[in-house]
Interface confidence: low
Amino acid sequence: LRRCLISVDMRLIEKSFHEIKRAMQTKDTFKNVTILSLENLRSIKPGDVCCMTNNLLTFYRDRVFQDHQERSLEVLRRISSIANSFLCVQKSLERCQVHRQCNCSQEATNATRIIHDNYNQLEVSSAALKSLGELNILLAWIDRNHLETPAA
């Protein structure tokens, strides 16, 4: 099974995330709750990686980036930059969808549902804040499973 490679420079996303991470994680009052379950991500099979990545990016695009209540102009700029980069990553994945490399199994659907359920258990702005603070988990996931990083 060939990996679905993406050609977005993840360093730029990581840099933007790092610049908002401290603000997000300091404000997060639910320190012992996680939305992106580690066990959940570890259990994803290679054939589900493309689908799961797409699902995670859609989750961030349609929920997290819409729900957060951040008002700081600096932070908003960073979040916009990350959101735009995610769109580029999703564009990159479309090539794999065309080649039928992005089909979703029931396990991937269940794993995605768990993330949405975790998110739904918190009040909307708290859930969005926590998910922004957990972006590093998603970045690690993408890095591990897809990355063909452009040369520095």
């Epitope: 993840m10 990581e14 590093n136 990083t149």
Partner: antibody
Framework: QEQLKESGGGLVQPGGSLKLSCKAS????????FSWVRQAPGKGLEWIGY????????LSAHTVNGRLTISSDNAQNTLYLQLNSLTAADTATYFC???????????????WGPGTLVTVSS | DIVMTQTPASVEAAVGGTVTIKCSAS??????LSWYQQKPGQRPKLLIY???VLTDGVSSRFKGSGSGTEFTLTISDLEAADAATYYC??????????????FGGGTEVVVK
């Protein structure tokens, strides 16, 4: 307040094993990568191993390859180091350190424990 | 494996002066370089990462520069509290070899 605190140091016999703990407080262990770094008396810092909490994988320096195990217990919010077949060269203060991010910032550390001294001697 | 060479091993300067510490990597590490300060009996403290990004709360008297294989830490307007050992560290974690994550040998800064 975010803190790390190592424990388990002391005197160990050559050939013996060592198990150190690093208790995290004020943040969830599972959201960060962690390394163990050691410092022999009067010497510089030596990176010895890293644990990636998302994928559970570890990375070790050549000096401890095959002797080092790093693990974590997210429920206890604690990181562990086990080092086997100890020699006098393993005598050092052992620090646990938190990476400031994943992917490209995983191995640069913004939070350190105070360290715990391990002496390997008969 | 990457080798990080720090120079000088020790440097002495007066209060108000400037100190420059150099760190050289045996192969390109792009901008994957951090600087730490460590005082005797204490844990290291992160000053700079990404070769030039100052950590929150660190004085702007500390300045990091460089990329590739040559890096510099400059401490200006030296204070007595800056007396410490300074370490550079490569963290080019794209490598599967742990020995890419090495520290330099350290530079002791003595403030007169």
């Amino acid at each position: 307040q975010e803190q790390l605190k190592e424990s388990g140091g002391g005197l160990v016999q050559p050939g013996g094993s060592l198990k150190l703990s690093c208790k995290a407080s004020g943040f969830p262990l599972s959201s960060y990568g962690f390394s163990w770094v050691r410092q022999a008396p009067g010497k510089g810092l030596e990176w010895i191993g890293y644990l990636d909490p998302v994928f559970g994988s570890t990375l070790s320096a050549h000096t401890v390859n095959g002797r080092l195990t790093i693990s974590s217990d997210n429920a206890q919010n604690t990181l562990y180091l086990q080092l086997n077949s100890l020699t006098a060269a393993d005598t050092a203060t052992y620090f646990c350190a938190r990476g400031i991010g994943y992917v490209y910032y995983g191995y640069t550390y913004d939070l350190w424990g105070p360290g715990t001294l391990v002496t390997v001697s008969s | 494996d990457i080798v990080m060479t720090q120079t000088p091993a020790s440097v002495e300067a007066a209060v108000g002066g400037t100190v420059t510490i150099k760190c050289s990597a045996s192969a390109s590490i792009y901008e994957y370089l951090s600087w730490y300060q460590q005082k005797p009996g204490q844990r290291p403290k992160l000053l700079i990462y990404g070769a030039s990004v100052l950590t929150d709360g660190v004085s702007s008297r500390f300045k990091g520069s460089g990329s590739g294989t040559e890096f510099t830490l400059t401490i200006s307007d030296l204070e007595a509290a800056d007396a410490a050992t300074y370490y550079c560290q490569s963290y080019n974690d794209g490598s599967s070899s742990g020995d890419a994550h090495v520290f330099g040998g350290g530079t002791e800064v003595v403030v007169k």
